[in-house]
Amino acid sequence: SERCDDWGLDTMRQIQVFEDEPARIKCPLFEHFLKFNYSTAHSAGLTLIWYWTRQDRDLEEPINFRLPENRISKEKDVLWFRPTLLNDTGNYTCMLRNTTYCSKVAFPLEVVQKDSCFNSPMKLPVHKLYIEYGIQRITCPNVDGYFPSSVKPTITWYMGCYKIQNFNNVIPEGMNLSFLIAFISNNGNYTCVVTYPENGRTFHLTRTLTVKVVGSPKNAVPPVIHSPNDHVVYEKEPGEELLIPCTVYFSFLMDSRNEVWWTIDGKKPDDIPIDVTINESISHSRTEDETRTQILSIKKVTSEDLKRSYVCHARSAKGEVAKAATVKQKVPAPRYTVEGGGGTGGLNDIFEAQKIEWHEGGGHHHHHHHHHH
């Protein structure tokens, strides 16, 4: 056949569906690739064609729309499975064409098995609830279009393996699950099972999501820079390694981008002609407050470097803050005779070194570090 605009395999839409459940899959062409919808395409005389390549095969096959009880069917721009089977797993292609136009895209469909407690390889969406914030709800996701509004399905909610009934602060209300007040103990996987009739058959839709209780916006503050601070002076001799940690606390904020960066003499480190390394580590509290540590490192510091201004900056949706580190060139200690008071000078040197080292390693008392070099 003639040339076709091929959008390739759209791995961004890795669709996962449960075995032995209905699945309705919209052709991604109209959602993400073309500027017109199915109705427009259809009225313009374009035809939508579906085919597939089964798992571990590279042979394109037509989809069998003549299976008993119309197990697989096409309706407008939707491919229906009533229900899915494990061996429906594969790459599906929808192609829109007429004699002069052709466009197609493929996408992976994975049919997955679940156990009796709803555990499966399915990637779960995460729903965040604010801690101690008042009534909040989650809604059973992705069930639109499976049955008409005239059909009244039964919905059962589970936390993990347990049916939710007589829970203190969690109340099932049809498609919604209400949390009267959310606590850390409410973290976990929640499953809704929607059961509905269709043409004398009963179908089940299973949807699981992860609830994560996070810091409340009521308690949110602008970023707090713990280090550098006014109590620590970074005194170094030329040739030594300079290590300055910037440790910042961020309150959890929904959809906020937390940023930490250093400037040296008002410029980004990349724009300064010195050999600077910055290592970042991130840790989270149970309510997803975040502590970011960026350690600025100059392996062999020069006397010019010790005169520069080193400023740590932090920004979140709550505001922007900055703090300068106090950096000095160490004055060489006077030489003492053995009989002289050298002992105390030596102790002071060790104390100074320990103090600076402790502050340089300031980020390391945080747990679960992920180092990004």
Epitope: S1, E2, T47, L59, E60, E61, P62, F65, R66, C102
Partner: antibody
Amino acid sequence: QVQLVQSGAEVKKPGSSVKVSCKASGGPFSQHAISWVRQAPGQGLEWMGGIIPFEGVAFYAQKFQGRVTITADESTSTAYMELSSLRSEDTAVYYCARSSSYYSWLDYWGQGTLVTVSS
Amino acid sequence: EIVMTQSPATLSVSPGERATLSCRASQSVSSNLAWYQQKPGQAPRLLIYGASTRATGIPARFSGSGSGTEFTLTISSLQSEDFAVYYCQQYNNWPWTFGQGTKVEIK
């Protein structure tokens, strides 16, 4: 009455290509699947691939993938099967046959086209 | 792909006798099986589809049975025009596959 009329016999050299046509009459063409089946001398039937002209997408058996091209021209109700890189083992009678869908029986057959590959 | 195996390869039967041809699929094809008759120099002709439904114009002496993996074509009383090669074909799974054929010859 549905009729499938195929093009005449061909003699081809190894390495060349052959294109066989199949013209349908007496019934709807576009919405049905046209398959190509071949039969080597004294051998059984071997399904090669098929197309629904209205859809314009052809599907092939693994064995012929990359070497066979099946097309259809709705305006003339004609389907075509082109086989490239011919070898002596491709000597066979090539049949076109119609079915109501890809997952259906072959209810009407063409008379067959003998393709001989010989140097 | 599904492998279709026919037996016997050749069946020698006297006119008027009953002929039973067998076809086995390597995995279930449900009832999506067809039988074809082919005479020398002719194209195949559809006899049975859906494992047991006779095609238009096929005499009642031809009958098909079976489902899943085991299928049978029975010719209740062989006529002279029935001596031919018979093929089974599955159309349940892509790609379609044929059996190697059973030749019914005059005993």
